[in-house]
């Protein structure tokens, strides 16, 4: 039978190394062992290349192309073939359809005056253009109620959150995820980093009365406080954004 | 040592065709494009043409298109130029020289960094 | 195609003086930051052509620091600095970035 492509290739770039394409088909296909996508840089003398397709479902195909660190006036030009019948071809922007990588190592810490530290690393070398592009989004829920959550966004440099213990509910179990953003680059969300809990252990302020209350900003430099003070809570709303590319 | 000799360069009627080797020595062939560049008497550098590294891709000026071919055999280390239907403004030194490293995803470039010594083709009746 | 025009045609310096050699081209050469496809070439009487300078100022392996390449997108300079009777030739300029390569019309430097 004919071979169709139902929703045609939507590519992203994490703007390092990687570009990765999407498509369905319009029946169940064996995407490695019947379609391969071609890509090639438009400039002169490049060669093409050949990326093999795997399934991420049964009628959608996803493929991975290793690529150069990215710049602006790349563009690469995109043949998905079905042996010798030319399916879709298009042309591709990395710069245009910027995908983070995921933000890595979350990690959650005790700090001074009833405050927890978010700490997770920014996945891209300094060298690279969105090093210091990066905006995040951590969300924080509670294990056991899925109505108590927040959403944070860390707009300031520097890959942290601190975190009132008194915003959360004593002896509760949380789970914290982050995920990376560049305005610059009108890019999409990354994917969520993997989830870290631990156990909020904060002795909420009733059970002070009549003792003396702690400060619970003391200790913490000028530069804590803005952090508090921009890690802004948000309503939370999810877009995405899917390109097409013809 | 990187090094480039050309042969082939002949006397040759206009119409006529002639064929132009390169045999390369001293660095990966396989890995670089390669260019072949003119130089007619008393005049500057032309350039002809160019192939990627696999030979898969292969450019040329207007003024040599549909007449002259540019090939390579990576297992012999040899770029070739095919030269049909000569005419007398064809008449030039022609030399290749190595070009772009072409295996990675965007071609390295070094400009032309080696060239050869040259070989003249004559076309006169 | 990218037009490249070089000035001056002829140029005649004394020994140990520095020369200065234009290159124009009609289409920007900047491909992205610091990669400007612009090269420069000398051909020596009776020789073939060397490569000096790639990416507007990247000079090639064993050629002297004397020679210098600056310029970015449309504009560029050749410097040869303390001049040698040997940096007699013709001197060109080409862009590597699309097809078809073109070249300069070629500087002629004379020493004096």
């Known amino acids: 039978g004919s071979v169709k492509v139902l929703h045609e290739p939507s590519c992203f770039s994490d703007y390092i190394s990687t570009s990765v394409c999407q498509w369905k088909m319009d029946h169940p296909t064996n995407c490695s062992a019947e379609l391969r996508l071609s890509y090639q840089l438009d400039f002169m003398g490049s060669e093409n290349h050949t990326c093999v397709p795997e399934n991420r479902e049964d009628s959608v195909c996803v493929c991975s192309m290793p690529i150069d660190d990215a710049v602006e006036a790349d563009v690469y030009q995109l043949d998905l073939w079905a042996g010798q019948q030319l399916l879709w071809s298009g042309s591709f922007q990395p710069s245009k359809h910027v995908k983070p990588r995921t933000p890595g190592n979350l990690t959650v810490h005790p700090n001074i005056s009833h405050t927890w530290l978010l700490m997770w690393t920014n996945p891209y070398p300094t060298e690279n253009h969105l090093h210091s592009e990066l905006t995040y989004m951590v969300n924080v829920s509670n294990d056991n109620d899925p109505e108590d959550f927040k959403v944070y966004n860390v707009t300031y440099m520097g890959p942290t959150l601190r975190l009132a213990a008194s915003t959360l509910k004593s002896g509760a179990s949380y789970s914290a995820r982050v995920r990376a953003w560049a305005q610059t680059y009108n890019s999409t969300w990354s994917d969520w980093s993997p989830s870290t809990t631990w156990l909020n252990y904060y002795e909420p302020w009733e059970q002070h009365l009549g003792k003396p209350i702690p400060n619970p900003l003391l200790g913490l430099d000028s530069t804590g406080l803005n952090d508090i003070f921009e890690a802004q809570k948000i309503e939370w709303h999810e877009h995405h954004h899917h390109h097409h590319h013809h | 040592e990187v090094q480039l000799v050309e042969s082939g360069g002949d006397l040759v009627k206009p119409g006529g065709s002639l064929r132009l080797s390169c045999v390369a020595s001293?660095?990966?062939?396989?890995?670089?494009?390669m260019t072949w560049v003119r130089q007619a008497p008393g005049k500057g550098l032309q350039w002809v043409s160019l192939?990627?590294?696999?030979?898969?891709?292969?450019y040329y000026a207007d003024a040599v298109k549909g007449r002259f071919t540019i090939s390579r055999d990576n297992a012999k280390n040899t770029l070739y130029l095919q030269m049909n239907s000569l005419r007398a403004e064809d008449t030039a030194v022609y030399y290749c020289?190595?070009?772009?490293?072409?295996?990675?995803?965007?071609?390295?470039?070094?400009?032309?960094?080696?060239w050869g010594q040259g070989t003249l083709v004559t076309v006169s009746s | 195609d990218i037009v490249m025009t070089q000035t001056p045609l002829s140029l005649s310096v004394s020994p140990g003086e520095t020369a200065s050699i234009s290159c124009r081209s009609s289409?920007?050469?900047?491909?992205?930051?610091?990669?400007?496809?612009l090269d420069w070439y000398l051909q020596k009487p009776g020789q073939s052509p060397q490569g000096l300078i790639y990416?507007?100022?990247k000079r090639l392996s064993g050629v002297p620091d004397r020679f210098s390449g600056s310029g970015s997108g449309t504009d560029f300079t050749l410097r040869i600095s303390r001049v040698e009777a040997n940096d007699t030739g013709v001197y060109y300029c080409?862009?590597?970035?699309?097809?078809?390569?073109?070249f300069g019309q070629g500087t002629k430097l004379e020493i004096k």
């Open positions: 020289a190595v070009d772009r490293l072409t295996k990675t995803i965007r071609p390295q470039y070094y400009g032309l960094w080696v």
């Open positions: 001293g660095f990966t062939f396989r890995d670089y494009a």
């Open positions: 192939i990627s590294g696999s030979g898969g891709k292969t």
């Open positions: 289409q920007s050469l900047l491909y992205s930051i610091g990669y400007n496809y």
């Open positions: 990416l507007g100022s």
């Open positions: 080409m862009q590597g970035l699309q097809s078809p390569l073109t």
